[in-house]
Amino acid sequence: MAFAPIPRITWEHREVHLVQFHEPDIYNYSALLLSEDKDTLYIGAREAVFAVNALNISEKQHEVYWKVSEDKKAKCAEKGKSKQTECLNYIRVLQPLSATSLYVCGTNAFQPACDHLNLTSFKFLGKNEDGKGRCPFDPAHSYTSVMVDGELYSGTSYNFLGSEPIISRNSSHSPLRTEYAIPWLNEPSFVFADVIRKSPDSPDGEDDRVYFFFTEVSVEYEFVFRVLIPRIARVCKGDQGGLRTLQKKWTSFLKARLICSRPDSGLVFNVLRDVFVLRSPGLKVPVFYALFTPQLNNVGLSAVCAYNLSTAEEVFSHGKYMQSTTVEQSHTKWVRYNGPVPKPRPGACIDSEARAANYTSSLNLPDKTLQFVKDHPLMDDSVTPIDNRPRLIKKDVNYTQIVVDRTQALDGTVYDVMFVSTDRGALHKAISLEHAVHIIEETQLFQDFEPVQTLLLSSKKGNRFVYAGSNSGVVQAPLAFCGKHGTCEDCVLARDPYCAWSPPTATCVALHQTESPSRGLIQEMSGDASVCPDKSKGSYRQHFFKHGGTAELKCSQKSNLARVFWKFQNGVLKAESPKYGLMGRKNLLIFNLSEGDSGVYQCLSEERVKNKTVFQVVAKHVLEVKVVPKPVVAPTLSVVQTEGSRIATKVLVASTQGSSPPTPAVQATSSGAITLPPKPAPTGTSCEPKIVINTVPQLHSEKTMYLKSSDNR
């Protein structure tokens, strides 16, 4: 599998409509919780919790502060922690407790505490429960949590130093935790947790399961350096621990290795960054998407692998176990266990078969079973990804978070759209297209290029958004910027399953927002722009420049996958310095203007989509160079002369008979043509027009070719 290409389009922060929320002097907006029925987004930040309108997060509805007392800060600082940063209260758990309350935990100056937040009064109840085992002491330590039927399941560290990892269930009637033993958890970095419900009509009377995802130091592979391993672990919701062996401990804790590698190159992604569980009516079993980086990531590699949950369950239900054996110098080695396995199966949830054998609860399980799972929590079998390969591998980027949406294109094809955030504040939107990855777009969510810490996807029909949290605030982005594609070709070439061209309105529309989704709309996920209707009109610009001056002709082709070149009087321009230059890699500079430079200039783009090449006329300029006698008095047109040598620009609309896409012979001018190779970096501000004219109509000429004004964005 090849590396994913660069994003086709890069949207700068200012180019698209993004809604932002941040409060002065509040940082670390890392906990997000969406209440779809209330259209409210709850935001947990440092020392504060906010409720904002989920449809417009800039509208704050409520706020509550949970600050650390000066006394607590001082005690924390005495232990060597920073009073300004670490000895504060970082909200780490923000979970629904009931229809009217949230369960909130914070680091609380290295004395983790939890409380109930009343959503009516938006005040804390002042319970001040001990948050140990539910929330980390250190804001820098990893954590994950999920609320299941009023009980909090957490993965975090249990002590001040962060040296005792724990996966626990906070429950009044049956609290459980992991054994503090290396085979169970070995310096884990917790990533994600979620509950997977069993269908009520499940034939085996199975239990709901809670899955935990983390990276830990390997016990089974030992090299000179510590090898990190991505893990999937699971516990059963009905687990009550053992009566004697594994008392108050999980009897159902099993873990397995997650495989995400590129088989052909030996490239192994072994650091888990984030996980998203995709549930969809069309999916019998949930699919989880996991985001990885390699352990030694000096080149900025990231990968996404997708897994069927049934694959993981198969490993836990029928897979072989690993066992530790002591070899020379009391060195421990982990190998496959091939001996007899006690019954009931160690680590299994209590199902109808177990109940039939009178094992109605884990408290009744025989000590042989419990002792076995205590000593063998690690499975020998690994969980392999769908198709045995990553869905996406990207170079030169560090992905941080992932959410996935399953959507249906106009032709009925179902696409899993991956929204992946980066450590530079961007969001990539990607899909798999016929075993290749297409990164539809990159959106710069945060101006300061700060890492995205949290990503959340709304699942409500209609207005759907991605919410991203960072150190400085939260950004709300729509799932697609369809309206930014100004032409049918642009709309089709975007290959965005959310977008389709509407000929009646001549706009690119979001599918889920249209009344009758398929009527007359054009969407071609193959990128075949020939389906677009013919147009006979195009816009062009007429410029008047003075003799000897310099002209800049603009060309704002948004596609990073397109090659841009210029034609003058239907001949491809050669890079004959000092006559021509490129500004911002797309705009044409013409130096030392003379009458011979007058004429028609066209900016063309060439984009390969599958095995087809799509040509477009992006911009057309008519240039007229005039000899201007030196005026005796100050010129009356000085207001228009904004660029020194430019006298005036006017926009004309005309029929464009005779213009056609360049032939391959003309296009093949690799030696001398001024071309623009695909651009990996986000488009800079150098493409910004000097004179902005917003009234230019978007009109088409022939198929797979259109003319548009240079300042179209």
Partner: antibody, heavy 122, light 108 residues
Framework: QVTLRESGPALVKPTQTLTLTCTFS??????????VTWIRQPPGKALEWLAL???????YYSTSLKTRLTISKDTSKNQVVLTMTNMDPVDTATYYC??????????????WGQGTLVTVSS | SYELTQPPSVSVSPGQTASITCSGD??????VYWYQQKPGQSPVLVIY???KRKSGIPERFSGSNSGNTATLTISGTQAMDEADYYC???????????FGTGTKVTVL
């Protein structure tokens, strides 16, 4: 109705082996989760746990007395036998047997015998 | 070996609250059971699994377990509550049950 009755010698000599039998009714030691345990209490002192045997024939012993204790069961007779070797006067105590409820019932020492006083003296 | 320490005695006036503690290392990792023993009788379970009251036991008996200490609370103590009370737990590292040292509750 569950009942347990301890039986054995009231007097044993030092260095001798004590054999105690717990005969029970109202439950079966083949039922999942059930166990029978032995506890003793020297006169005027605290309770001390000795040993346990469960339905799955798992056996546990007090670490301080492990080398001297043996527990066994005869499910057909509804009996549990505890033997204690090398008796000493400090082993003088009331010896109780008790039923341990299944885990899902709470796993506690649910029903106790009335106890049998064993005196170790020469 | 693992030890559970209880105060030797607790005195309480009728109607008042008696609290009996049971201390042991990381006791909240274990289930604590409380037994009541009256003179000349076999022990009877009062509280199991930290805080669950056995059926037939009056509501005035309650239990808790946090950190290194478990507590049996008798609110509105009555004369009939005068007895010896023992805490008990399973010690998993040595696979054995351990009883506390016992507390004599006297109702004044």
């Amino acid at each position: 109705q569950v009942t347990l009755r301890e039986s054995g010698p009231a007097l044993v000599k030092p260095t001798q082996t004590l054999t105690l039998t717990c005969t029970f009714s109202g439950f079966s030691l083949t039922t999942t989760g059930v166990a029978v345990t032995w506890i003793r209490q020297p006169p005027g002192k605290a309770l001390e746990w000795l040993a346990l045997i469960d339905w799955d024939d798992d056996k546990y012993y007090s670490t301080s007395l492990k080398t001297r204790l043996t527990i066994s069961k005869d499910t057909s007779k509804n009996q549990v036998v505890l033997t204690m070797t090398n008796m000493d006067p400090v082993d003088t105590a009331t010896y109780y047997c008790a039923r341990i409820a299944s885990g899902d019932s709470g796993g506690y020492f649910a029903d106790w015998g009335q106890g049998t006083l064993v005196t170790v003296s020469s | 070996s693992y030890e559970l320490t209880q105060p030797p005695s607790v005195s309480v006036s009728p109607g008042q609250t008696a609290s009996i503690t049971c201390s042991g290392d990381k006791l909240d990792d274990k289930y604590v059971y409380w037994y009541q023993q009256k003179p000349g009788q076999s022990p009877v379970l009062v509280i199991y699994m930290d805080n669950k009251r056995k059926s037939g036991i009056p509501e005035r008996f309650s239990g808790s377990n946090s950190g290194n200490t478990a507590t049996l609370t008798i609110s509105g103590t009555q004369a009939m509550d005068e007895a010896d009370y023992y805490c008990q737990a399973w010690e998993s590292s040595s696979d054995q049950y351990v009883f506390g040292t016992g507390t004599k509750v006297t109702v004044l």
